[in-house]
């Protein structure tokens, strides 16, 4: 998601499962840090935002035609799992140590 | 990149290498379609935008706290190569049939 004037980076995003209605099936944790990718993808794209060639091209086109083409976007490029205790289809509390794709590990410009 | 009210989709983006200063080393093609990912990632995220769990979580948090958290972003999720003729370090015209990551194959919400 886009941010103010800071460059693309990972920031904390505390998520409470009750707020998103997932407390009906996720028993634990009550909340976790999903993290969020915030900030702009400005020219020149730094190595730490691991830009694809397409992101570099789009950034250059945006520089030339800012009203025609948007900037590349700061998004999660690598996700991490979390451990959860959830109710399965039979209502049995079940532990899952690697519930994939729930937390941002790395952000980049895409 | 973000769009108006349409949902996340792939749109044409003709790129002229002269416009971005790459004509100094890319001899052919003169231009190509890089495509662009445009549009919003609105709730509920459809299957065709192949949302990650994190994107779904972020969308739900945005729904609850729209000023605190941004929407997921519409970005390339799969890229395609193009063929290029370029000048190598020796200045020799060189054909590369798979110059990776230059064109959008698929867009999604991340």
């Amino acid at each position: 998601s886009t941010g103010a004037s800071s460059h693309c980076q990972k920031t904390s995003l505390r998520v409470n499962f009750e707020d998103i209605g997932w407390d009906s099936w996720i028993i634990a944790p009550k909340e976790y840090d999903a993290y969020e990718c915030k900030g702009g993808c400005f020219f020149p794209l730094a190595d730490d935002v691991t830009p694809t060639k397409h992101a570099i091209v789009q950034t250059l086109v945006h520089l030339k035609f800012p009203t025609k083409v948007g900037k590349a976007c700061c998004v999660p490029t690598k996700l991490s799992p979390i451990s959860i205790l959830y109710k399965d289809d039979m209502g049995v509390p079940t532990l899952k140590y690697h519930y994939e794709g729930m937390s941002v590990a790395e952000c980049g410009c895409r | 990149s973000t769009g108006a009210s349409s949902h996340c989709q792939k749109t044409s983006l003709r790129v002229n290498f002269e416009d971005i200063g790459w004509d100094s080393w890319i001899i052919a093609p003169k231009e190509y379609d890089a495509y662009e990912c445009k549009g919003g990632c609105f709730f509920p995220l459809a299957d065709d935008v192949t949302p990650t769990k994190h994107a779904i979580v972020q969308t739900l948090v945005h729904l609850k706290f729209p000023t605190k958290v941004g929407k997921a972003c519409c970005v390339p999720t799969k890229l395609s190569p193009i063929s290029i003729l370029y000048k190598d370090d020796m200045g020799v015209p060189t054909l590369k049939y798979h110059y990776e990551g230059m064109s959008v194959a698929e867009c999604g919400c991340r």
Epitope: - | A28, P29, K30, Y32, S83, V92, P93, T94, L95
Partner: antibody
């Protein structure tokens, strides 16, 4: 200077195989694909395929799929083109040519005759 | 495969003439087009690459133009050493194809 030197003329019987070599010098062999092109007597140019000398991956013209094999030996900067199940129509001059066809070998005449 | 059609298939011209050979691709090939000259018993020689770029060492009387499907090779003032067969070639598709050739003869 940059050059490609091919092996000598060959006479083969129908059904046999021929292997033509192409030795590169004056440049880094692994930096450029090697193409093979043939030309039947009095006819035009026909592209057969290429080999990437780094990984050895190949791309063959549909017409020659299953009959042509392109290989390379990077230690001696040499590319090879082997054509099997020869027929009289394969009588031609066979050329190797560097990536963008800027440098060509001198050609190897392969005659297929019973 | 992409078909490359050259015209004319042969032409007669005199020294000093301006000669134009055309090449049409069966589908768009951007500017992935090359022109070659071939003399009897010799390997082809690259004249023009990427439709309009003159290969190093080639005389400036040779020029190329075009993009998409229609291309032209022009010899501004034909010289005695220019009598040969000329081929166009597309390198846009991974299956490379040549035109059938244009023979330039002395009138």
């Amino acid at each position: 200077q940059v050059q490609l030197v091919q092996s000598g003329a060959e006479v083969k019987k129908p059904g046999a195989s021929v292997k033509v070599s192409c030795k590169a010098s004056g440049y880094t062999f692994t930096s450029y694909y090697m193409n093979w092109v043939r030309q039947a007597p009095g006819q035009g140019l026909e592209w057969m395929g290429w080999i990437n000398p780094v990984q050895g991956n190949t791309n063959y013209a549909q017409k020659f799929q299953g009959r042509v094999t392109m290989t390379r030996d990077t230690s001696i900067s040499t590319a090879y083109m082997e054509l099997s199940r020869l027929r009289s129509e394969d009588t031609a001059v066979y050329y190797c040519a560097r990536n963008y066809f800027d440098v060509w070998g001198q050609g190897t005449l392969v005659t297929v005759s019973s | 495969d992409i078909q490359m059609t050259q015209s004319p298939s042969s032409l007669s011209a005199s020294v000093g003439d301006r000669v134009t050979i055309t090449c049409r691709a069966s589908q768009t090939i951007s500017n992935f087009l090359a022109w070659y000259q071939q003399k009897p018993g010799k390997a082809p020689k690259l004249l023009i690459y990427a439709a309009s770029n003159l290969q190093s060492g080639v005389p400036s009387r040779f020029s190329g133009s075009g993009s998409g499907t229609d291309f032209t090779l022009t010899i501004s003032s034909l010289q005695p050493e220019d009598f040969a067969v000329y081929y166009c070639q597309q390198l846009y598709a991974e299956s490379i194809t040549f035109g059938q050739g244009t023979k330039v003869e002395i009138k």
